[in-house]
């Protein structure tokens, strides 16, 4: 007999063909011989089966000798052997209906686990293979678990259920609640305005929660809360902000913070957390601030950076249009008795300039 796989909630067509391309008597019954539907004259008649209100047939195909039964809004319990009686012959079709659902909400925080559960008819032994949007393959039986979701797991998961060499495909949309970046670094010259942005990697109709930015300044012994805020339907409102520095926050998404001036005492790293309503756990984004200062004091020209820099970064002092250069993999460089002219202080990573500051050295008479 023919095997057909169906999806819970879906519609399936069970085909039944007669050799003669004309209207003829036909009936569909279940394995208990209860009539589901059939033909009486030119009318489609329904039997006492539980399926009858969800079963139909395509009249215009009867002339082609096709007496299919269409079952709408499939249920697991519709799994059965169905018998089509036409032209004094019986055709059997085994229908197996499967359902695949996420155990929890499909909006999950980064790091949380996802469990997919397969509903299947008794006596079946299906296998399941799921592919994440990023191309990760996971196999399982009645359950499939993804222990730690990453932001690249956001999107449509395609799961294939196999039984008796037949397959049926499920698509499940998973939204991983996370910031677009795990970490970002802002490089600024002393005195410049600093913009911090925290774009989200997802969109929700209603977004409500609360957040806080904790800051660990390089010069400070402990971290402190710089700002706390509320988020209501994508509108941001500040709850509390420190006096120094006096941060400003944008009223709309993406979350946006402005520090009026980059100063050495602010250089360091922060952690922005966002707790969403009805979700356990918090979203995190790390943000770093690196501040550069170039000064001339008496016969000494100095360039310094504060904040979290990697040891492989190079700090250089260079005289414009001249070969004179001092470079160090350090947080400060200096030149004694510098030549007059425009000097450039450069913070670079493998030749790529991250930050530069110019200082004019005037001749001393």
């Amino acid at each position: 007999k023919k095997v057909v796989l169906g999806k819970k909630g879906d519609t399936v067509e069970l085909t039944c063909n007669a050799s003669q391309k004309k209207n003829t008597q036909f009936h569909w019954k279940n394995s208990n011989q209860i009539k589901i539907l059939g033909i009486q004259g030119l009318f489609l008649t329904k039997g006492p089966s539980k399926l009858s209100d969800r079963a139909d047939s395509r009249k215009s195909l009867w002339d082609q000798g096709c007496f299919s039964m269409i079952i709408k809004n499939l249920k697991i319990e519709d799994s059965d052997t169905y018998i089509c009686e036409v032209e004094n012959k019986k055709e059997e079709v085994e229908l197996l209906v499967f359902g695949l659902t996420a155990n929890s909400d499909t909006h999950l925080l980064e790091g949380q686990s996802l469990t997919l559960t397969l509903e299947s008819p008794p006596g079946s032994s299906p296998s399941v293979k799921c592919r994440s949007p990023g191309g990760k393959n996971i196999q399982g039986g009645r359950t499939i678990s993804v222990p730690q979701l990453e932001r690249q797991d956001s999107g449509t998961w395609t799961c294939t259920v196999s039984q008796d060499q037949k397959t049926v495909e499920f698509k499940i949309d998973i939204v991983v609640l996370a910031f677009q970046k795990a970490s970002s670094t802002v490089y600024k010259k002393e005195g410049e305005q600093v913009e911090f942005s925290f774009p989200l990697a997802f969109t929700l109709e209603k977004l409500t929660g609360s957040g806080e930015l904790w800051w660990q300044a390089e010069r400070a012994s402990s971290s402190k809360s710089w700002i706390t805020f509320d988020l209501k339907n994508k509108e941001v409102s500040v709850k509390r902000v420190t006096q120094d520095p006096k941060l400003q926050m944008g009223k709309k998404l993406p979350l946006h913070l402005t520090l009026p001036q980059a100063l050495p005492q602010y250089a360091g790293s922060g952690n922005l957390t966002l707790a969403l309503e009805a979700k356990t756990g918090k979203l995190h984004q790390e943000v770093n601030l690196v501040v550069m200062r170039a000064t001339q004091f008496q016969e000494n020209l100095t360039c310094e950076v504060w904040g979290p820099t990697s040891p492989k970064l190079t700090l250089s002092l260079k005289l414009e249009n001249k070969g004179a250069t001092v470079s160090k993999q350090a947080k400060a460089v200096w030149v004694l008795n510098p030549e007059a002219g425009m000097w450039q202080c450069l913070l670079s990573d493998s030749g790529q300039v991250l930050l530069e500051s110019n200082i004019k050295v005037v001749p001393t008479w």
């Epitope: 909630g9 879906d10 067509e13 395509r58 009249k59």
Partner: antibody
Framework: QVQLQQWGAGLLKPSETLSLTCAVS????????WSWIRQPPGKGLEWIGE???????NCNPSLKSRVTISVDTSKNQFSLKLSSVTAADTAMYYC?????????WGQGTLVTVSS | DIQMTQTPSSVSASVGDRVTITCRAS??????LAWYQQKPGKAPELLIY???SLQSGVPSRFSGSGSGTDFTLTISSLQPEDFATYFC?????????FGGGTKVESK
């Protein structure tokens, strides 16, 4: 809720090929047939043809020689191509879901054939 | 092909009136008939299927009857939103065909 969203070129020259696509969302794609119907300005409705998820088609004999209907089940989309168009093919073209009757319709695409 | 003949082609009526539209199929189609409503610039909407079954969400003032060759759509008490064009359609055999339409307009 089932939704049908259709698109395609709205202005054609005689002898060109009309090409329209319809995307189905929010419901079952298998088990149903997916139709194309047209309506010339101020006139009645004409069934063009249909396809199911496995690619089985039925077409109106009056148009069959010029009609190609195809399906892309990976995207839940189906398409219509009507070759060698003339001014008589100017109409509003609709996609629709059918079992015996047309219960969900696309928004329609006005196709004008003019030299 | 099955010919679907709709009468009248237009009808003038007032709010609260009872409106009847007929559709004749040649040859007969048992109960494989539907009625649709179409408003200007919109796609048709299914009102009645299988000759007399009311589609979900359609007001009960709409009703359908008939079998074989003669079918009727009745609007028991015409409402302002019912001014539109109505089409019948047979699902008995290919090609699927529609009636020419009946325009219900304000008297």
């Amino acid at each position: 809720q089932v939704q049908l969203q259709q698109w395609g070129a709205g202005l054609l020259k005689p002898s060109e090929t009309l090409s329209l696509t319809c995307a189905v969302s929010g419901g079952s794609f298998s088990g149903y047939y997916w139709s194309w119907i047209r309506q010339p300005p101020g006139k009645g409705l004409e069934w063009i043809g249909e396809i199911n998820h496995s690619g089985s088609t039925n077409c109106n004999p009056s148009l069959k020689s010029r009609v190609t209907i195809s399906v892309d089940t990976s995207k839940n989309q189906f398409s219509l191509k009507l070759s060698s168009v003339t001014a008589a093919d100017t109409a509003m073209y609709y996609c629709a879901r059918v079992l015996n009757f047309f219960d969900y319709w696309g928004q329609g695409t006005l196709v004008t054939v003019s030299s | 092909d099955i010919q679907m003949t709709q009468t009248p082609s237009s009808v003038s009526a007032s709010v609260g009136d009872r409106v009847t539209i007929t559709c004749r199929a040649s040859p007969g189609i048992s109960n494989w008939l539907a009625w649709y409503q179409q408003k200007p610039g919109k796609a048709p909407e299914l009102l009645i299927y299988a000759a007399s079954s009311l589609q979900s969400g359609v007001p009960s003032r709409f009703s359908g009857s008939g079998s074989g060759t003669d079918f009727t759509l009745t609007i028991s008490s015409l409402q302002p939103e019912d001014f539109a064009t109505y089409f019948c359609q047979q699902a008995n055999s290919f090609p699927l065909t529609f009636g020419g339409g009946t325009k219900v307009e304000s008297k």
